[in-house]
């Protein structure tokens, strides 16, 4: 297993609709054809997997149908979008990239993006 540098923004504020997008960029040492991207969430020392996708270079990322993540790839960049976020989902989202094929296997883990999520203010009751 060889190490690889992964860069991602330090802080992102999700939209009022609970959507956060960020770019995860990796310094590919070779010509990988198969890449796996995993998003991990770290909150209060607990690390959980949010979503993962394996893709062939030049093709779209395919997450599971029920995944809260979508993404696109361009060269050594992956543009990740996480949807359906609420204030309780605020935390550090870490991008993990694995170059699966061809060998050698490379692994890179970013420093994480702190995603802040603000629940929208409830609408005041109206007399209609």
């Amino acid at each position: 297993c060889k190490a690889m540098h992964v860069a991602q923004p330090a802080v992102v504020l999700a939209s009022s609709r609970g959507i956060a997008s960020f770019v995860c960029e990796y310094a590919s040492p070779g010509k990988a054809t198969e890449v796996r991207v995993t998003v991990l969430r770290q909150a209060d020392s607990q690390v959980t997997e949010v979503c993962a996708a394996t893709y062939m270079m030049g093709n779209e990322l395919t997450f599971l149908d029920d995944s809260i993540c979508t993404g696109t790839s361009s060269g050594n960049q992956v543009n990740l979008t996480i949807q359906g976020l609420r204030a309780m989902d605020t935390g550090l989202y870490i991008c993990k990239v694995e170059l699966m094929y061809p060998p050698p296997y490379y692994l890179g883990i970013g420093n994480g993006t702190q995603i802040y999520v603000i629940d929208p203010e409830p609408c005041p009751d109206s007399d209609f």
């Epitope: 923004p9 330090a10 020392s45």
Partner: antibody
């Protein structure tokens, strides 16, 4: 080195608006957020809100909602805070600070004194 | 909104003494997202501690932070003349990012 440099002191009349700038250097501006904090004379720190320089999304303190607007110009790595309908109790030193996620507000500007007086 | 309470309001000590400052949160949020700042007259605040216990770059090891949940402490092991200032705690785990009212450490 990493720093935030703010615009100079302002004197405004009640009802007017003020726009304070905060120029960042020494780091990738869009990777972080910028928060604004004010301090009235002899008082503590009051958080006003922040903007994610990555996507321009904003979050304001409830008491200032509707009066404050925070923006960024990524081409010049500058953040702006505009406060409208100024009142005498808006007289304060206004600080910008870098929002660094887990690393808190790690870099602060030198402060901008805004005086509201008729 | 998480409300932070700091105690005491003022702490009068002599150089060389140990200072213990307390910060209590009204509710337990992301407990590790607590910071301490130092502010001297006419200056901007300076980050001392983030993540409840991690020292910021360039901060001397006489400053230490501890605590979790709703109770946090900033300890200055041996006060130096330059440590006499106002200290603020802040929670930044959820919006709004509230500050405590501050503790003034002055010379006895």
């Amino acid at each position: 080195q990493v720093q935030l440099v703010q615009s100079g002191a302002e004197v405004k009349k009640p009802g007017a608006s003020v726009k304070v700038s905060c120029k960042a250097s020494g780091y990738t501006f869009t990777n972080y957020g910028i928060s604004w904090v004010r301090q009235a004379p002899g008082q503590g720190l009051e958080w006003m809100g922040w903007i994610s320089a990555y996507n321009g999304n904003t979050n304001y303190a409830q008491k200032l909602q509707g009066r404050v607007t925070m923006t960024t110009d990524t081409s010049t790595s500058t953040a702006y805070m505009e406060l409208r309908s100024l009142r005498s109790d808006d007289t304060a030193v206004y600080y910008c600070a870098r929002v660094a996620g887990y690393d808190a507000f790690d870099i602060w500007g030198q402060g901008t004194m805004v005086t509201v007086s008729s | 909104e998480i409300v932070l309470t700091q105690s005491p309001g003022t702490l009068s000590l002599s150089p060389g003494e140990r200072a213990t400052l307390s910060c209590r949160a009204s509710q337990s949020g992301s407990s590790s997202y607590l910071a301490w700042y130092q502010q001297k007259p006419g200056q901007a605040p300076r980050l001392l501690i983030y993540g409840a216990s991690s020292r910021a770059t360039g901060i001397p090891d006489r400053f230490s932070g501890s605590g979790s949940g709703t109770d946090f402490t900033l300890t200055i092991s041996r006060l130096e003349p330059e440590d006499f200032a106002v200290y603020y705690c802040q929670q930044y785990g959820s919006s709004p990012f509230t500050f405590g009212p501050g503790t003034k450490v002055d010379i006895k």
